[in-house]
Interface confidence: medium
């Protein structure tokens, strides 16, 4: 008789989750010499230990501390790019501007990017059927707590000028409920961070509005200023051309028609 299993509102653990995490870890440590010392089996064990046999609505940051310790990584603190609701472009940018880093360019971010996972209380099984949804079920689920933990640490590490890419096509360009708005903004350290520079990415080809004047951007400016960090905002009207110019800075059209 199949055992009754809690039915959650969100999708279940990503297929072949253990194999994916292990393979990603091996690949990352091969590509990044500074992380060659990392034992990927230990990383997987620590990752698994954070959520296996635990109620998937009762996960804490403490559960992820062994994994955080193993994944400790130093990225240049003045080369950090945060993003909100525009992950693909942010990743395209750091692929071209190789000395800048998003969270997903670090080992822990790379391991978990686009994956879902959860376990079950008192069993060693991974739940491939369903996992808690942040809104409909609970916020202290394995995936949400993981991203909150790594995002907080990433923001805390930042210094000097921190850049953030924001999606100008959304109704809330800056959303207080996003990971950026709820975690990263509040964990930038004023004694280290001088300026947060927002890059607002335009979606429409003919959109010449100044989205830096958007009320949600003004709200972000207010939050940042109150934290004693300077704020600046830039429009990126044509992200395709912008990326092209970062990729090929010798292109003569790159100081006009962007």
């Amino acid at each position: 008789v199949p055992r009754w299993r809690q039915q959650w509102s969100g999708p279940g653990t990503t297929k072949r989750f253990p194999e994916t995490v292990l393979a990603r870890c091996v690949k990352y440590t091969e590509i990044h010499p500074e992380m060659r010392h990392v034992d990927c089996q230990s990383v997987w064990d620590a990752f698994k230990g954070a959520f296996i046999s635990k109620h998937p609505c009762n996960i804490t940051e403490e559960d992820y501390q062994p994994l955080m310790k193993l994944g400790t990584q130093t990225v240049p603190c003045n080369k950090i790019l945060l993003w909100s609701r525009i992950k693909d472009l942010a990743h395209q940018f750091t692929q071209v501007q190789r000395d800048m880093f998003t969270l997903e360019d670090t080992l822990l971010g790379y391991l978990a990017d686009d994956l879902t996972w959860c376990g079950e209380f008192n069993t060693s099984k991974i739940n491939y059927q369903s996992c808690p949804d942040w809104r409909k079920d609970c916020s202290n689920n394995p995936v949400s707590v993981f991203w909150k933990t790594v995002s907080r640490r990433f923001a805390e590490a930042a210094c000097d000028v921190v850049h953030v890419m924001l999606n100008g096509s959304r109704s809330k360009i800056f959303d207080k409920n996003s990971t950026f708005g709820s975690v990263e903004v509040h964990n930038l350290q004023p004694e280290k961070v001088q300026t947060l520079e927002a890059w607002v990415i335009h979606g429409g080809r003919e959109d010449s509005r100044d989205l830096c004047q958007d009320p949600t951007i003004k709200e972000l400016e207010s939050i940042i200023s109150k934290r004693n960090i300077q704020f600046s905002c830039k429009n990126i009207y044509r992200p395709d051309k912008f990326l092209q110019c970062v990729k090929n800075p010798e292109d003569s059209s790159c100081t006009s028609e962007i």
Epitope: Q194, T195, S208, N235, S252, T255, E257
Partner: antibody
Framework: QVQLLESGGGLVQPGGSLKLSCVAS????????MNWVRQAPGKGLEWIGK????????NYTPSLKDKFFISRDNAKNTLYLQMTKVRSEDTALYYC????????????WGQGTTLTVSS | EIVMTQSPASLSASLGQRATISCRAS??????????VHWYQQKSGQPPKLLIY???NLESGVPARFSGSGSGTDFTLTIHPVESEDVATYYC?????????FGSGTKLEIK
């Protein structure tokens, strides 16, 4: 905050050379196109030229193309302007300015450094 | 090269009134989406300061009494209402193609 600080100006004889520097702080210098602009006493602004982030492309206003040379050192956050064969009409206040690639506008300027060409 | 012709060369405006400065390009500085004209304010003894970019966008921190308009070859900077701290020389500048060029400047005085 963003700061650009020019230095190296002074008195030079006609035909002489001088190298100006502009030290940048408060932003990621290696991401930005940088420019030199000059202003003769009591006159308007004249764009001299610009250099892209990795120094692979440098553009000049045609009249100064073989006289002035722009370079940068991203490790030192510094922009340079090497001036050769200077004449009295090169006497001016020389500004460095940051160009924001997404608009083409000069969003930050230094305070300027003065070159005086006189015998 | 594109020549930017500014007018008038000097302008006297009363406090609280409207001041209008024009800039004409010798050929179009607009694409289908944007007009590559920028306006700067230069106060005595200071470097220029960006006021308006892409013809009509207000640079961060610039008071809303400054506005820009225009497309193609004709552009306008408007200051309304004029305040005493607006005494300065104003320049237009294009970045449509190389070389970049500036207008000759308009000096604003208060009556």
């Amino acid at each position: 905050q963003v700061q650009l600080l020019e230095s190296g100006g002074g008195l030079v004889q006609p035909g002489g050379s001088l190298k100006l520097s502009c030290v940048a702080s408060g932003f990621d210098f290696s991401l930005y196109w940088m420019n030199w602009v000059r202003q003769a006493p009591g006159k308007g602004l004249e764009w001299i030229g610009k250099i892209n982030p990795d120094s692979s492309t440098i553009n000049y206003t045609p009249s100064l193309k073989d006289k002035f040379f722009i370079s940068r050192d991203n490790a030192k956050n510094t922009l340079y302007l090497q001036m050769t064969k200077v004449r009295s009409e090169d006497t001016a206040l020389y500004y460095c300015a940051r160009l924001w690639i997404a608009t083409g506008g000069f969003d930050y300027w230094g305070q300027g450094t003065t070159l005086t060409v006189s015998s | 090269e594109i020549v930017m012709t500014q007018s008038p060369a000097s302008l006297s405006a009363s406090l609280g009134q409207r001041a209008t400065i024009s800039c004409r390009a010798s050929s179009s500085v607009s694409s289908s989406a944007f007009s590559y004209v920028h306006w700067y304010q230069q106060k005595s003894g200071q470097p220029p300061k960006l006021l308006i970019y892409l013809a009509s966008n207000l640079e961060s921190g610039v008071p809303a009494r400054f506005s820009g308009s225009g497309s193609g070859t004709d552009f306008t900077l408007t200051i309304h209402p004029v305040e005493s701290e607006d005494v300065a020389t104003y320049y237009c500048h294009h970045s449509r193609e190389l070389p970049f060029t500036f207008g000759s400047g308009t000096k604003l005085e208060i009556k």
